[in-house]
């Protein structure tokens, strides 16, 4: 009984299209596949960062597969054949591993890239990045952003840079048409006529750092003898009110804080009849329901009722 | 005539364990690949785990790695899906499956009946 | 992961009619579809595979089309048993193999 073995696959590479660390991982079926013609070959493909602790695993019938990276480290890559029983009248048959890598040659010490690098979607419309220079560059050093997400045909750079002291510091992105719920790839780099700059990639989901403004419209109204119902409306912008969470503090009489966390654009509260002052403020945050995280916004202006008697009227700003 | 036939489901407090078990007959069990799916009440299909028919390779979904564990007992003709932490949302029917033709999925060909498994305090 | 949407969701019609569901794949799946029937309380059947493969003992009327990201199961002719869910499904790259969210095929 000859042992049937099959071939790894050829020519596995990973491709970088400059996407900043989207990339292709492509390979030519094996050699001698003539024996298996009536087959259907698949690939079982394991790649990681290196450094990372787990491999993915992917398995498919194709000669391509693409992903993201974090190209501030290197990636390590492994492929091999699967034939499925059917191709061998038995057991299943895997070939060894065909391995590949990739990295970017850095340029300059670490310490000359970008420091704390800070992106927040505001309000879901506008996209602001800042960050600082690197440690100990000279002010002739400049830093350039670029960005990609998927819909796009070429890395972009930045058009509106901030500036200080005539060096970059942040970037007022444009309008990014369908830019949420897919990877968001950066990459800053620089340059100086002293010495090389380090090149700094991030990756990040846009609905994932959203800072909405804060709600508006806040009101009481007198519920029954021992209950006020707190209301406010959504900030205006592209946020449907499904996607909210908001924090609401409240201070009776400069005494009590109650502080709670709500799904809905009211809250109740007991109080008693002696209550003098009420004051409350509210903001918002996007919910689990829209992202994975989220940004608090700015608190509300506060919304005080004080010295007349709750139970006559709706309270209104 | 192929059969898949599952059992152990039942009901089971948030964080408990359960163990499936899927006996199976009618084809030879230690070729094709098999395949776990559930469906939530009122609720699609969901593909859970997979493994290939020596059960050399196993594949799962993002939603119960680290808590579930396929096997088989290719001696006993027998597929199992080992649940631990169980969550409220792991309640569904879980169906055993095999595997039409594929290293570890691909059309799936033959259905069990179907175990309901409901996790709830 | 690939993502599966079939359309419609719901779909009325009546004995005799020509029913067409339609499923699309976020990225190419080349034809590495297949296509289920479930009715209440059971399990699912498998209907097509490899996108116009039709299982064994699966009626005629039944015919699967398409390859890259759309594809359409047809039903030539609705009959009373025919009323149902149907599911599309893709095995062309896993971990996940996924599903669309299927279609009720129901009463007019």
């Known amino acids: 009984d000859t042992e049937i073995k099959v071939n790894p696959p050829q020519d596995f590479e990973i491709v970088d299209p400059g996407y900043l660390g989207y990339l292709y991982l492509q390979w030519q079926p094996p050699l001698s596949l003539d024996h298996f013609k009536e087959c259907t070959v698949e690939y079982e493909l394991k790649y990681r960062n290196i450094g990372s602790e787990t491999w993915k695993t992917i398995i498919t019938k194709n000669l391509h597969y693409k992903d993201g990276f974090d190209l501030n480290k290197g990636i390590e890559a492994k492929i091999h054949t699967l034939l499925p029983w059917q191709c061998t009248n038995g057991s299943e048959v895997q070939s060894s591993w065909a391995e590949t890598t990739y990295w970017i040659s850095p340029q300059g010490i670490p310490e000359t890239k970008v420091q704390d690098m800070d992106c927040v979607y505001y309000n879901w419309q506008y996209l602001l990045c800042s960050w600082k220079p690197g440690i100990g560059v000279l002010l002739d050093t400049n830093y350039n952003l670029f960005y990609w997400y998927e819909g796009l045909d070429h890395a972009l750079q930045c058009v509106d840079y901030i500036k200080a002291d005539g060096q970059n510091i942040g970037c007022r992105f444009p309008y990014l048409e369908a830019s949420d719920y897919k990877d968001f790839y950066i990459c800053v780099n620089g340059s100086s006529e002293n010495k090389p700059i380090r090149s700094s990639y991030f990756t990040f989901q846009l609905q994932n750092i959203v800072k909405p403004l804060p709600p508006v419209y806040l009101t009481f109204t007198r519920e029954s003898s021992c209950e006020i119902k707190l209301k406010w409306s959504i900030p205006l912008g592209p946020i449907p009110a499904r996607c909210f969470d908001y924090e609401i503090e409240i201070r009776e009489d400069d005494t009590t804080l109650v502080t709670a966390t709500v799904e809905n654009e009211t809250y109740t509260l007991k109080t008693t009849n002696e209550t003098r002052q009420l004051c409350f403020v509210v903001r918002s945050k996007v919910n689990i329901y829209c992202s994975d995280d989220g940004i608090w916004s700015e608190w509300s202006d506060k919304q005080c009722w004080e010295g007349e008697d709750l139970s006559k009227k709706t309270l209104l700003r | 005539e192929v059969q898949l036939l599952e059992s152990g489901g039942g009901l089971v407090q948030p964080g408990g364990s359960l163990r499936l078990s899927c006996a199976a007959s009618?084809?030879?069990?230690?070729?094709?690949?098999m395949t776990w799916v559930r469906q939530a009440p009122g609720k699609g299909l969901e593909w859970v785990s997979a493994i290939t028919g020596s059960g050399g390779s196993t594949y799962y979904a993002d939603s119960v790695k680290g808590r579930f564990t396929i096997s088989r007992d290719n001696s006993k003709n027998t597929l199992y899906l080992q649940m631990n932490s169980l969550r409220a949302e792991d309640t569904a029917v879980y169906y055993c499956?095999?595997?039409?033709?594929?290293w570890g999925a691909g059309a799936f060909d033959y259905w069990g009946q179907g175990t309901l498994v409901t996790v709830s305090s | 992961d690939i993502q599966m949407t079939q359309s419609p969701s719901t779909l009325s019609a009546s004995v005799g009619d020509r029913v067409t569901i339609t499923c699309r794949a976020s990225q190419s799946i080349s034809s590495w579809l297949a296509w289920y029937q479930q009715k209440p309380g059971k399990a699912p059947k498998l209907l097509i595979y490899d996108a116009s493969s039709l299982e064994s003992g699966v009626p005629s009327r039944f015919s699967g089309s398409g390859s890259g990201t759309e594809f359409t199961l047809t039903i030539s002719s609705l009959q009373p048993d025919d009323f149902a869910t149907y599911y599309c499904q893709q095995y062309d790259t896993y971990p996940p193999i996924t599903f669309g969210q299927g279609t009720k095929v129901e009463i007019k």
């Open positions: 009618g084809f030879t069990f230690r070729r094709p690949a």
């Open positions: 499956v095999k595997v039409r033709y594929g």
